[in-house]
């Protein structure tokens, strides 16, 4: 959301850094929340769970079944997902090379207890010449490839693993917990699951100028969620924002001095990263050492200033998710500037994208002047509207409070995720982006 | 008990043949990739042959290749070296071991072997 | 053809530890066994995938693998420990290779 100009451009293709052996991404336990979750139970041919395995007939993968049992081709939905996205890696990376599978769902018990293998949420791969050299880079396109945890394991085989199908981690989406507050114009804070439309909250400009701006929905929102946040602290000054592992955040430059605010660069479009300005990054991206923007009070002006990120965990929270949507494409949440926009990691990209969107509500407000938040059917509210309210949403879309407000992901952000899964690349969208239905 | 016993050595001439055996017990034999190593008297260990559990992948030294045959029986728990064209530096203490690897993607060491049976080319 | 290179002796006084190396090139993309042979004996495993030991093979036993150079360290040597020790190589394109074996004596 937000600051498109200034905050960056289109970024060039990355240099991937190969895993060392033995090293795992990301640095955490294979079944804690943060990689694959926890071991759900040993899937069996005869149990009632086997259905949820899918056999993965991908001539563009090369299996090597030692048992002869067809085995290794089963795996979930999300694991198969991920398989079929690095196969294509493979193949632009090596010309003629494959990907190959030597343990997929394993049901002889070779592993060790509780693994993954067992409930065809794990992989063993190589590449099809098996030329250990490739191996650590072959980890890394896993990775690229949006595996939840994958594992330099052997001189022989990278291990990767997914999240369970149900997990509430797997679908993470882009979104604040509940207890999060925002500023409002008329003074003090507000929990974000209180929101209303009408509340002009604290955001920042293209050229990081603090400013209010209306809040417009909730782009996703689930009063009931159980989900895993990034947590993101910083020292000077002591802030602490939980959000998505998808949700982006803005990241300071490096040559940003640490009393400036946020400089523009020439051009509009996403950050590039560099010194060219702030670039949004997904938070799961957010490492410690890098600064985000937080607001501080100078002279008794208010402005944003860089902050140094101390640590970066993670911590299940259950107050709800939600992702709300300014004007301006940019909120202050906790105190520190965050983007509205998630699940694709090119801010101004996204927040060309809510164009019609702002412009419908601006047409709306204009139209009918208080009757612009976000229409159910029946269900009156705190604020004006009630029946006869102009719907801005489609049927089942995420409500504003006071609006006969269902949960769920907005259809506008749904439409534009489906448009974004076929015109762009996978670096671009962030694994965790969706809560969709696997096909 | 895990156990591992090599026959078949013997005195033959040079461009003569000979066929060791390896009789396995105390484990599933098909499971585990087999091997023979040798070594010369007075010298080190020296890989001849392997005989992978996982597809049937075979492999010699380049010194023996040609002239020496691997092979296995899942049936019996046996694994063979039939050696054509023997040479003088043939001339060893032939064993046979065992490993749970498959040699392809897997590999764990010989962590079982036989006594040896002796070999011995000369005219 | 591919060549493991062992120092052919190494001596080490009670209760010390003894290094016995073996190198080769890329070393470390390799997984490393190690054998004890006494003479008149068959060899046996005492560290297989580099650093791991096989079950009733003491502690004292440790391997390691880096660059070009994987160690075997004997920590506490004891007069039992006086053997022959072969590194041995394995990858999952080139056949299985021996060192040239290293005679540990225990002063």
């Known amino acids: 959301c937000g600051p498109g100009r200034g905050f960056g451009k289109r970024r060039h293709p990355k240099k991937l850094t190969p895993l060392a052996y033995k090293q795992f991404i990301p640095n955490v336990a294979e079944k804690t929340l943060g990689a694959s979750g926890r071991y759900e139970g040993k899937i069996s041919r005869n149990s009632e769970r086997f259905k949820e395995l899918t056999p993965n007939y991908n001539p563009d993968i090369i299996f090597k079944d030692e048992e002869n049992t067809g085995a290794d081709r089963l795996m979930t939905q999300r694991c198969k997902d991920k398989l079929n996205a690095l196969a294509i890696s493979v193949m632009n990376q090596w010309p003629g090379v494959k990907l190959r599978v030597t343990e997929g769902w394993d049901e002889d018990g070779h592993h060790s207890e509780e693994s993954l293998h067992y409930e065809g949420r794990a992989v063993d791969i190589t590449t099809s010449d098996r030329d250990r050299s490739k191996y650590g880079m072959l980890a890394r396109l896993a990775v690229e490839a949006g595996f939840d945890w994958v594992y330099y394991e052997s001189k022989a085989h990278i291990h990767c693993s997914v999240k369970a199908e149900n997990s509430v981690a797997a679908k993470s989406g882009g979104c604040f917990p509940g207890s999060a507050t925002v500023h409002l114009e008329q003074g003090g804070t507000k929990l974000v699951k209180d929101l209303s439309p009408g509340d002009r909250v604290l955001a920042a400009d293209d050229q990081g100028r603090l400013l209010y701006s209306d809040f417009l929905t909730f782009l996703d929102r689930d009063d009931g969620a159980k989900k895993v946040f990034y947590v993101i602290e910083t020292r000077e000054p002591r802030e602490r924002l939980l959000l998505t592992a998808a949700h982006l955040l803005f990241v300071a430059p490096h040559n940003d001095s640490a009393t400036g605010e946020p400089e523009a660069s020439s051009g509009s479009g996403p950050p590039s990263g560099g010194a060219l300005g702030p670039r949004a990054l997904f938070a799961s991206r957010v490492r410690p050492g890098q600064r985000v923007y937080v607001v501080a009070e100078r002279d008794g002006d208010r402005r944003l200033l860089p902050a140094a990120v101390h640590s970066v965990t993670l911590s299940e929270e259950a107050a709800g998710a939600y992702a709300p949507l300014t004007a301006q494409g940019t909120i202050l949440i906790n105190r520190v500037l965050a983007s509205c926009y998630a699940v694709i990691e090119e801010h101004s990209w996204a927040h060309r994208a809510f164009a019609p969107f702002r412009l419908a509500h601006a047409l709306l407000a204009a139209l009918a002047p208080a009757r612009t938040d976000r229409g159910g059917d029946s269900g009156g509210g705190d604020r004006g509207g009630g029946g006869g309210r102009v719907a801005l949403t489609a049927p089942g879309a995420a409500d504003a409070p006071g609006a006969g407000a269902t949960a769920g992901i907005h259809w506008y952000s749904q439409l534009l995720y489906q448009i974004g899964t076929w015109l762009l690349d996978s670096e671009a969208l962030h694994p965790l982006g969706m809560a969709v239905k696997s096909s | 008990e895990v156990q591992l016993v090599e026959s078949g050595g013997g005195l033959v001439k040079p461009g003569g043949s000979l066929r060791l055996s390896c009789a396995a017990s105390g484990f599933t034999f098909s499971s585990y990739s087999m091997n023979w190593v040798r070594q010369a008297p007075g010298k080190g260990l020296e890989w001849v042959s392997s005989f992978s559990s996982s597809s049937s992948y075979i492999y010699y030294a380049d010194s023996v290749k040609g002239r020496f045959t691997i092979s296995r029986d899942n049936a019996k728990n046996s694994l063979y070296l039939q050696m054509n064209s023997l040479r003088a530096e043939d001339t060893a203490v032939y064993y046979c071991a065992r490993d749970r690897g498959d040699y392809v993607d897997y590999y764990y060491g010989m962590d079982v072997w036989g006594q040896g049976t002796t070999v011995t080319v000369s005219s | 053809s591919y060549e493991l290179t062992q120092p052919p002796s190494v001596s080490v006084s009670p209760g010390q530890t003894a290094s016995i190396t073996c190198s080769g090139d890329k070393l470390d993309y390799k997984y490393i066994s190690w054998y004890q042979q006494k003479p008149g004996q068959s060899p046996v495993l005492v560290i297989y995938?580099?650093?791991k030991r096989p079950s009733g093979i003491p502690e004292r036993f440790s391997g390691s693998n880096s660059g070009n150079t994987a160690t075997l360290t004997i920590s506490g040597t004891q007069a039992m420990d006086e053997a022959d020790y072969y590194c041995?190589?394995?990858?999952?394109?080139?056949?299985?290779?021996f060192g040239g074996g290293t005679k540990l004596t225990v002063l």
């Open positions: 041995q190589a394995w990858d999952s394109n080139t056949p299985l290779v």
């Open positions: 995938q580099d650093i």
